[in-house]
């Protein structure tokens, strides 16, 4: 299915930063592995791969085509 890369943004909804208070987010975090269709506005976000939306974080991530890496699958994997 290619390489999965996570967008660095977490929108703060699940306390993506260690310095943030995550006390009120434990129930949502159980859904961290769930994905939905990417919003239409991210149609061109993933350059060499397909976009999926991390439900718990409300942020796009890319599943890269074979041979590509990077948050947006924008780089050729030299080790591929």
């Amino acid at each position: 299915d290619g390489n999965s890369t996570r967008s660095p943004e977490t929108n703060g909804l699940l306390c993506g930063d260690p310095e943030e208070n995550c006390a009120a987010t434990t129930t949502q975090s159980k859904r961290k592995g769930h994905f939905s269709r990417c919003p239409k506005q991210y149609k061109h976000y993933c350059i060499k791969g397909r976009c999926r939306f991390v439900v718990a974080e409300q942020t796009p991530s890319c599943v890269c085509d074979e041979g590509y890496i990077g948050a947006r699958c924008e780089r050729v994997d030299l080790f591929y």
Partner: antibody, heavy 116, light 106 residues
Framework: QVQLLESGGGLVQPGGSLRLSCAAS????????ISWVRQAPGKGLEWVSY????????NYADSVKGRFTISRDNSKNTLYLQMNSLRAEDTAVYYC?????????WGQGTLVTVSS | DIQMTQSPSSLSASVGDRVTITCRAS??????LGWYQQKPGKAPKLLIY???SLQSGVPSRFSGSGSGTDFTLTISSLQPEDFATYYC????????FGQGTKVEIK
């Protein structure tokens, strides 16, 4: 705690330019998408633009496309909005907000007035 | 562009009342909808995301529901600090906000 502090607003004539800045602190700026959202006096909210964490994926509202440019400097934890060819209808409080789809932290806003 | 239409544009209510605000999208947006609260002279505050998920730190009297084109924000028992303007926002296509609903004291 998360803080976003906008600056650079002021009075400008129609056709003029202005550059807004947003200084971020309290979180790892380089990991987050950031947006500009504006609010004309007594009116509702209007999303203006966003930029992804790496500064490579950008979108604009149709109303500002071709006139405004969003950018960021992750080494300075700062977001920018270069506004050119300003019009009276661009008069608003401009907020920077954390996020691209949803906005969980907002600055206090900076007022831009376009008037002759 | 997706248009977001809120109703009512304003309402009067008393402390303890149950308040419902609706938001309709001009086309289906699945559950890509957020709700914000804004008080005069202040920045907006995120209340609800993904149509029904409560943002961290927001009181449980706020709830959201709906999918597709029709969405609802409910305040189960209005508190004095809840008098404000509420906005919905879709984030399927490029982000757009509703025109706002002002909740005033009766």
């Amino acid at each position: 705690q998360v803080q976003l502090l906008e600056s650079g607003g002021g009075l400008v004539q129609p056709g003029g330019s202005l550059r807004l800045s947003c200084a971020a602190s309290g979180f790892t700026f380089s990991r987050y998408w950031i947006s500009w959202v504006r609010q004309a006096p007594g009116k509702g909210l209007e999303w203006v633009s966003y930029i992804d964490s790496g500064g490579t994926f950008i979108n604009y509202a149709d109303s500002v496309k071709g006139r405004f440019t969003i950018s960021r400097d992750n080494s300075k934890n700062t977001l920018y909005l270069q506004m050119n060819s300003l019009r009276a209808e661009d008069t608003a409080v401009y907020y920077c907000a954390r996020g691209g789809s949803l906005f969980d932290y907002w600055g206090q806003g900076t007022l831009v007035t376009v008037s002759s | 562009d997706i248009q977001m239409t809120q109703s009512p544009s304003s309402l009067s209510a008393s402390v303890g009342d149950r308040v419902t605000i609706t938001c309709r999208a001009s086309q289906g947006i699945i559950s890509y909808l957020g709700w914000y609260q804004q008080k005069p002279g202040k920045a907006p505050k995120l209340l609800i995301y993904a149509a029904s998920s409560l943002q961290s730190g927001v009181p449980s009297r706020f709830s959201g529901s709906g999918s597709g084109t029709d969405f609802t924000l409910t305040i189960s028992s209005l508190q004095p600090e809840d008098f404000a303007t509420y906005y919905c926002q879709q984030y399927d296509a490029l982000n757009t906000f509703g025109q706002g609903t002002k909740v005033e004291i009766k």
